[in-house]
Interface confidence: medium
């Protein structure tokens, strides 16, 4: 920031200058001296503070003009002022020049000053209120003691009849829209009029012009008009100087999220410009800068309390819908059904969207990330979710082809973790990818870049390409441990399934039948004995367990987990023609987590003493922890289409109480 400037004196004449409080004016008395001058003395008015600086040493001038200094090339004056002027050019510094011993000056130079206060102010201390001239406003630091203002991307839609998010145009239609914006105040104080030839300008850089927008409310008392003054094609705005003490309130909106090549930081500047002569550019004599960080999009892990559960209504899922409704009624959240006119036959609501939120000290709201998958549910987020205080963001690849890995069953987030002393208070994003060197499917780069650029939930890439569908929610889930801040990682495990089945076989239940009561499937009489004796199935699942273990090791390393933090849920997979895995029976790990209530795919496992041994086993693992297991029949409406409960539902959750700006990424 420009905090010092030089003013050139001229003997025999008066020089006028505008001084901005908090800055230094330097002036060279030596160069301005008349011939024959050897010494100089100084006089100044009471609100002016003058120092004689020689060789970097400053001496305060506390005089009535009696003292004299030697004229020397290394002698300069440093001038500051303590308060704004009430009239233009009313404060002065007079330099009298003398020959060696003379008591009468041989000439003099005058500096006539107009002191004004200019401060561009924001909520740099992050308490929700704009403070005055915070010294840290021009920098941005993370952590509980961090400083720097925060900006929300204005990605909601306050006005229902408009097709897009508020940040997509340069208009403000309501006061509500201003509440999403961060306030910025330009404070000025000074005489009624500035001397001729000065101008105050707000401006942004070209590189920030597509990232930030600034509005000014004209006529705050009658028929407000919201004027767009900065952003997009508008790089600067001349501010009318009104004199006296003035505060101009501006509203600042973010236009885009942090991303590849954009850290999230934007700067806004105010400059006092001086006019020299016609056809000569205005020169800045003072600049004040504020920095905003655009709030990142934050995902919400399973351990956070649910607010709404979303599910699609299909021709064939009436019973499933009913069971989900019953589960939701046990919790204190609401069920939101996406009907057929909107889902158009697409049941995979988990894959279409990911719920998250954005937050600033003054405001926060949920924001849905729309996947590039764009199935028949593609209109749902814009038509049903985008609205007042509900934002929308999407990332679409330009050239890459979209694969199943771009669906958001392949996008999860862990609870808060600490890894080797480094804390991730908002958890870490988990995405599925291909095995290193395999050249397989990978989530599209634009989405990966977007997720990484948010900085607060550093992503971890897992290996999910071994699955037919290829989503991380097919082999892992997190559950809270009720009454504690701890959580458990649930992992699908083929070895746990074989171990359980062998135990049951050993106990004499080898002929226990799977898929009982399911018509065609139960007529095949799939028993424990048949499964254990199917050598190719055994081999396939040994391979699949290696894939699971690869992910287990990554998760332990990257989330700082131990074996005690992981519970294995029995699962079996069948290899498809591309040598990828699909669930043999409903995959229990693909569950919906609503606080302590778990909606688990009903596995239709072998019936031992009229009970499903898989359900019994899972209850035995989870219910002692205080979790309640509800098994939901998804076999005909979801499982047979290669998905389960989690794939067919979505949950909007409460945001973290932890403030993202308190972390250090």
């Amino acid at each position: 920031m420009l905090r010092e400037r030089t003013v050139r004196l001229q003997y025999g004449s008066r020089v006028e200058a505008v001084y901005v409080l908090g800055t230094y004016l330097w002036t060279d008395v030596y160069s301005a001296a008349p011939a024959g001058a050897q010494t100089f003395s100084l006089k100044h008015s009471e609100h002016v503070w003058v120092e004689v600086v020689r060789d970097g040493e400053a001496e305060e001038v506390a005089t009535n003009g009696k003292q004299r200094w030697l004229l020397s090339p290394s002698t300069t004056l440093r001038v500051t002022m303590s308060q704004a002027s009430t009239e233009a050019s009313s404060d002065k510094v007079t330099v009298n020049y003398y020959d060696e011993e003379g008591s009468i000056p041989i000439d003099q130079a005058g500096l006539f000053l107009t002191a004004i206060e200019i401060s561009l102010d924001v909520d740099a201390d992050r308490d929700g209120v704009v403070e005055k001239n915070n010294p840290k406003k021009a920098s941005w630091t993370w952590g509980p003691e961090g400083q720097g203002a925060i900006l929300l991307v204005n990605c909601d839609r306050e006005t229902p009849w408009l097709p897009k998010e508020d940040c997509r145009d340069e208009k403000v239609y309501s006061k509500e829209d201003l509440k999403d914006m961060s306030q910025m105040i330009l404070r000025t104080k000074g005489p009624d009029r500035l001397p001729a030839g000065y101008e105050i300008v707000l401006y942004i850089s070209m590189s920030d012009s597509d990232k930030v927008g600034v509005f000014y409310v004209e006529n705050p008392f009658f028929g407000q008009r919201y004027i767009h003054i900065l952003g997009r094609r508008k790089l600067y705005h001349v501010v009318k100087y009104t004199g006296g003490s003035a505060e101009l309130l501006f509203f600042v909106e973010g236009l885009c999220f942090p991303d590849e090549g954009f850290s999230g930081l934007v700067s806004i500047h105010v400059s006092l410009l001086e006019y020299m002569a016609q056809d000569i550019p205005l020169t800045p004599i003072f600049t004040d800068t504020v920095i905003f960080r655009i709030a990142p999009w934050i995902m919400t892990p399973n351990i956070l309390p649910p607010v709404s559960v979303f599910v699609c209504c299909m021709k064939d899922n009436y019973l499933f819908l009913k069971e989900v409704k019953n589960l939701v009624e046990k919790t204190n959240c609401e069920l939101k059904v996406c009907f057929q006119y909107l889902n158009r036959g697409d049941r995979w609501i988990q894959d279409e969207i990911e719920f998250g939120y954005i937050e600033a000290p003054h405001k926060g709201f949920p924001v849905v990330l729309d996947s590039p998958r764009d199935g028949n549910l593609k209109d749902f987020p814009v038509k049903e979710l985008l609205g007042p205080d509900f934002g929308y963001v999407t990332r679409e690849p330009l050239f890459e082809s979209v694969t199943s890995l771009d669906s958001f069953g392949n996008l999860e987030v862990s609870p808060p973790v600490t890894v080797n002393g480094k804390t991730y208070p908002l958890g870490r994003i988990l995405i599925g990818s291909s095995f290193p060197l395999s050249g397989g499917r990978r989530m599209t780069k634009v989405v990966r870049d977007f997720l990484k650029a948010q900085q607060v939930q550093a992503p971890v890439e897992l290996y999910s390409d071994w699955l037919t569908v290829g989503h991380v929610d097919e082999f892992m889930s997190f559950v809270p441990i009720p009454g504690t801040k701890k959580f458990l990682l649930l992992m699908a495990s083929t070895s746990a399934c074989y171990k359980l089945f062998r135990e049951k076989q050993k106990d004499g239940h080898g002929e226990a039948i799977m898929f009982k009561g399911l018509g065609g499937m139960s007529s095949k009489r799939i028993t424990i004995n048949k499964i254990l004796s199917n050598e190719s199935l055994v081999q396939e699942n040994l391979y699949f367990q290696r894939c699971l273990d690869w992910n287990r090791d990554i998760l332990k390393k990257e989330l700082g987990l131990t074996e005690q933090d992981i519970i294995d849920l029995p699962a079996l997979f069948k290899m498809d023609e591309d040598h990828r895995a699909r669930a043999f029976f409903p995959n229990m790990v693909n569950m919906i987590v609503l606080d302590k209530d778990l909606g688990i795919p009903k596995p239709f496992g072998p019936q031992v003493e009229e009970e499903c041994c898989l359900e019994m086993h899972v209850r035995g693992l989870l219910e002692p922890l205080g979790l309640e297991c509800t098994f939901i029949d998804d076999i005909s409406a979801y499982h047979k289409f290669l998905g389960e409960v989690h794939c067919g539902t979505n949950v909007r959750r409460k945001p973290f109480t932890f403030k993202w700006w308190h972390m250090v990424p």
Epitope: Q38, R54, D55, A62, K66, Q67, W69, L71, S72
Partner: antibody, heavy 118, light 107 residues
Framework: EVQLQQSGPDLVKPGASVKISCKAS????????MHWVKQSHGESLEWIGR????????SYNQKFKGKAILTVHKSSNTAYMELRSLTSEDSAVYFC???????????WGQGTSVTVSS | DIVMTQSQKFMSTSVGDRVSVTCKAS??????VAWYQQKPGQSPKALIY???YRYSGVPDRFTGSGSGTDFTLTVTNVQSEDLAEYFC?????????FGSGTKLEIK
């Protein structure tokens, strides 16, 4: 760091002369006057005069006119004071001092003791 | 010549006390007064200029005040290292003159 290094003590006979040097370092020599001050044993301080290092122009306390001659050598950043026709009254410690606020003396040399004795 | 009178040759004080050294000019010198501290066997050290402005590095327990003809150097919370002689000086007009000095003794 500003330093004023004076020459060592002198024992001189009555009627003789002595020239004391004061070498300045750590600042722009021509930007400050150099002052000279006398302190007789157990007495107060007396201002002798000052010299402008730019042009060698000097001003004296009337009492020391003809007794002290102040000069400078710009290229070596050194000021000199010559004391003439010495008597026992001239036995004292002599200080050079940089005139910060013109006559307020911000930095002092370590002093040079002059003893006049036969 | 302007005469600077420091009427007290000696002043006795204790560590932690507050002491005021006074100096009187024979005519009005406005605020063109400096104060110096001289410890035995050392050169004088500048403390105050323009009656009330501390030189950089001078502890804030040293305060100068006054204008016209009456000037005071006040030392609050006296420390043992403040044992020294204190001189005032006027530089309003030639020749510049010093007071006769006041010796501060620690009880």
């Amino acid at each position: 760091e500003v330093q004023l290094q004076q020459s060592g003590p002198d024992l001189v006979k009555p009627g003789a002369s002595v020239k004391i040097s004061c070498k300045a370092s750590g600042y722009s020599f021509t930007a400050y006057y150099m002052h000279w001050v006398k302190q007789s044993h157990g007495e107060s301080l007396e201002w002798i005069g000052r010299v402008n290092p730019n042009n060698g122009g000097s001003s004296y306390n009337q009492k020391f006119k003809g007794k002290a001659i102040l000069t400078v050598h710009k290229s070596s950043n050194t000021a000199y004071m010559e004391l003439r026709s010495l008597t026992s009254e001239d036995s004292a410690v002599y200080f050079c001092a940089r005139g910060d606020y013109l006559p307020s003396l911000g930095y002092w040399g370590q002093g040079t003791s002059v003893t006049v004795s036969s | 010549d302007i005469v600077m009178t420091q009427s007290q040759k000696f002043m006795s004080t204790s560590v932690g006390d507050r002491v005021s050294v006074t100096c009187k000019a024979s005519q009005n010198v406005d605020t063109t007064v400096a104060w110096y501290q001289q410890k035995p066997g050392q050169s004088p050290k500048a403390l105050i200029y323009s009656a009330s402005y501390r030189y950089s590095g001078v502890p804030d327990r040293f305060t100068g005040s006054g204008s016209g003809t009456d000037f005071t150097l006040t030392v609050t919370n006296v420390q043992s290292e403040d044992l020294a002689e204190y001189f005032c000086q006027q530089y309003d007009s030639y020749p510049f003159t010093f007071g006769s000095g006041t010796k501060l003794e620690i009880k």
